[in-house]
Structure formats: C-alpha cells, structure tokens
Interface confidence: medium
C-alpha cells in the first residue's frame, strides 16, 4: 500500500468504505420505493490524518492550515471519490418505473 | 434562495466558501514555490444540516442514517463542488516551472 493508504491511527480507523444495512424506512423511502426493501449502503467513514488518501492539492492545503489554525480550519473530510450505480424500482403516478442512480452508493473514498 | 441554501443554524453557520490568507511558510511551500508569496485560499467550511446544499442522493442517505445512527454514521461534510485554477511558479531540479493547479482553490461548496 502507498504511504497515503497506511492508517497511522490503527487498522480501520481512517477514511475507508463502510457498509451500513438500511431498510426503506431507515432511508425515508418507504412511500416511493418498491424494491429493494433493504439496501447495503456503502459510504465513506473515518478520520483523515495528514497525507492519508489526500484527494488533491486542496486537501493538502486544508490539512496544513488545520494544523496551524484548528479552530478556524477543519481537517479534511472522508467522502466518496466515485460511486457505484444502483437501480431502484419506484412507484409513480402511473404505476412503477426503474430508475438508475449514479450517485447513491460510494465506490471508493478519499480525503478532501 | 432555494430551501437547500437557507441555513437553519443562522447566517454563515452552514457550509459555505471561506477565504483564509496563508503564506508559503504556512503551507509548507516556501522552499519550492517562488510566487506568489501568499495565497488567498478559498475553502469549504461549515455545518451540513438536513437538506442543506445536498450534493446528491448519497448525501440524503447519509443524513438520514446519521439521524438514526449518529455514533456510526457521521453527518454529511462540507466540501468543494468545483475549483478555480491557480498558477504557481515553482522551483524544479532544472530551474523553474509554471504549474497550473485545477484543484487548489474551492469555487463553490456542497454537502456530501
């Protein structure tokens, strides 16, 4: 693994992909989604220590300024770098439809 | 303003563009950047309450799951939606170079 992928806080503590099981009720979708009834939501969770999975120059700057001015500038944040598509079967006024969402499930993560 | 742009926490408390003045020394660049000597770093800072500047479906899901499982799922995070370019004049092994960075200064912000 690159240096930027080794978590200095211990295994699993830094920014990475997590899976959270959620029902349609959990997601607030019960009224308009028919299927699936449960979703394995992949999302980005974890700390962003210095040099860990820095997305770009902006993330580097943010970390440097956070160290200097922690009360003003927050640390970089763990967010999706890309997404996996997901199809939902939805209720519509006329019946049902299949809708592909390209921005629903995180595929991989980085720090911004 | 759209509902998603009205901050329920009070003016300026939610995710928005902030400007932070930083010297090359602050950024750790003094040895390899010639010019400019200071940068007005634009970055995204602020809270992401429900429905505020949600970037996509993933952000909606994250907020819903955060309310259900706050210890497991963090709230959405304020990050750049796009960037402004910036030129740095840099020292190189062979002399100097002009480098345009497309991912250095945040242009606008959203919650992911």
């Amino acid at each position: 693994a690159r240096n930027g992928d080794r978590c200095p806080l211990g295994p699993g503590r830094c920014c990475r992909l997590h899976t959270v099981h959620a029902s349609l009720e959990d997601l607030g979708w019960a009224d308009w989604v028919l299927s699936p009834r449960e979703v394995q939501v992949t999302m980005c969770i974890g700390a962003c220590p210095s040099q860990f999975r820095e997305a770009n120059m902006h993330a580097q700057i943010k970390m440097n300024l956070h160290r200097l001015k922690p009360d003003t500038v927050p640390a970089p944040c763990c967010v999706p770098a890309s997404y996996n598509p997901m199809v939902l079967i939805q209720k519509t006024d006329t019946g049902v439809s299949l809708q592909t969402y390209d921005d629903l499930l995180a595929k991989d993560c980085h720090c911004v | 303003a759209r509902n998603g742009d009205r901050c329920p926490l009070g003016p300026g408390r939610c995710c928005r563009l902030h400007t932070v003045h930083a010297s090359l020394e602050d950024l750790g660049w003094a040895d390899w950047v010639l010019s400019p000597r200071e940068v007005q770093v634009t970055m995204c800072i602020g809270a992401c309450p429900s429905q505020f500047r949600e970037a996509n479906m993933h952000a909606q899901i994250k907020m819903n799951l955060h309310r259900l499982k706050p210890d497991t799922v963090p709230a959405p995070c304020c990050v750049p939606a796009s960037y402004n370019p910036m030129v740095l004049i840099q020292k190189t092994d062979t002399g100097v170079s002009l480098q345009t960075y497309d991912d250095l200064l945040a242009k606008d912000c959203h919650c992911v």
């Epitope: - | 003094a30 390899w32 010639l34 010019s35 030129v87 004049i89």
Partner: antibody, heavy 119, light 107 residues
Amino acid sequence: EVQLQQSGPELVKPGASMKISCKASGYSFTGYNMNWVKQSQGKNLEWIGLINPYNGGTIYNQKFKGKATLTVDKSSTTAYMELLSLTSEDSAVYYCAREVRLGNAMDYWGQGTSVTVSS
Amino acid sequence: DIQMTQSPASLSVSVGETVTITCRASENIYSNLAWYQQKQGKSPQLLVSAATNLADGVPSRFSGSGSGTQYSLKIISLQSVDFGSYYCQHFWGTPWTFGGGTKLEIK
C-alpha cells in the same frame, strides 16, 4: 516606510555589461519577491523577471534570458540586475518593483535607472 | 505569450468627467490583473490588484472590474491629479505582459 533606492543613470558602450542595484528598506526583504521592469521610450513596459530572496529562485521572461541576470544580497537587503552584451536596444529606464505578498501585483517601485547605450 | 490589448490608446477629457479604460487578454486570465498609473518622469503606481482590489491609499473614485478576458478601470469625477498614463498587467502564466497603455490628457 517602504523604499526601493536604485543606482544612478548609466552611459555605457555597446558590448559592455553593467549592474543596477536596488536597495530595499522599511520591510522584511526576504518576505517579498523583487521584480524588474524595462520601459523603453517612456512608453512600453516589459516584465524582465523576478527573484525570490527567501529561496533564491528566479524566473525570467524568455526574451531577457541571457540578457539579464537577477541576484540578491540578503545581508545588505539589495537586489541586483546585471545586463549583458549591451546594444542600443537596451537603452531604457529599468525599474525594480516589490511584488505584493498576496497575488502578484507590484506595490512599490524604485525611482528607475536610466541606461543609455552609445559609443 | 498572453497579449494584453488596452483601449483607447489616448483619451482627452475634462475634470469632473467619468472615464473607462479597457484591457482585453488574449485568453482567460482568471482575474489575475493589475492596473497602474504613471505620471510623466515618475515610476508606475499600483491602483488595483486581482482585477477589483483597490490598493492602499487609492481614492474610491477608482474601481476595477471584469473577468475572463475582459477588464476595465473606471475613474469617476476625474481630478487634475488623475491625468497621466494607465497600464494593465496580467499575472496568469509568464511572461507577465503589460497593455500598451492609455494616455489620459486634460481637454
């Protein structure tokens, strides 16, 4: 008070070289870049290049590479520009100008040094 | 190199009038532009940086505007001390070229 004091006017022969000085005072010399600008016939302004006194780095307008050499002496807070192999085309007023820290404009200028190249 | 085209080249106006000087860049310079004033026999003086930021001590009758490739310097209610030459300069990639200048003369 920020001041940039340049050396006096020069009359030099074609083919000769010469060095213009720019003594900086009233601010932290290494904290600001120094630029050099040429003005011909009281009109056209041309950027020659800059030097970063903190790390010694220089960048030149390609047009002046080999014509101008920029240096600094941190101990005396003085910037120098050496002009090489002078021709009549080099007759002009030359300015040193401090670069603002934030961004790249030039906020303080020397009084200018008039250089006349003539045999 | 980026070319800076300044217009007009000269302008004859009366005290109290409003003038606008424009500068067009040959490509997008992302507001990395300064304006200078130069009096006869004197060094240039910074008026505006980053396209719109008035330099310290510059009267509020001066204002800079623009984006992309088009920029302007506006002087309202011209005073006798405002007469002289004005130059724009870009800072987007080197060389940092200047416009050809605008000479502002008293009518």
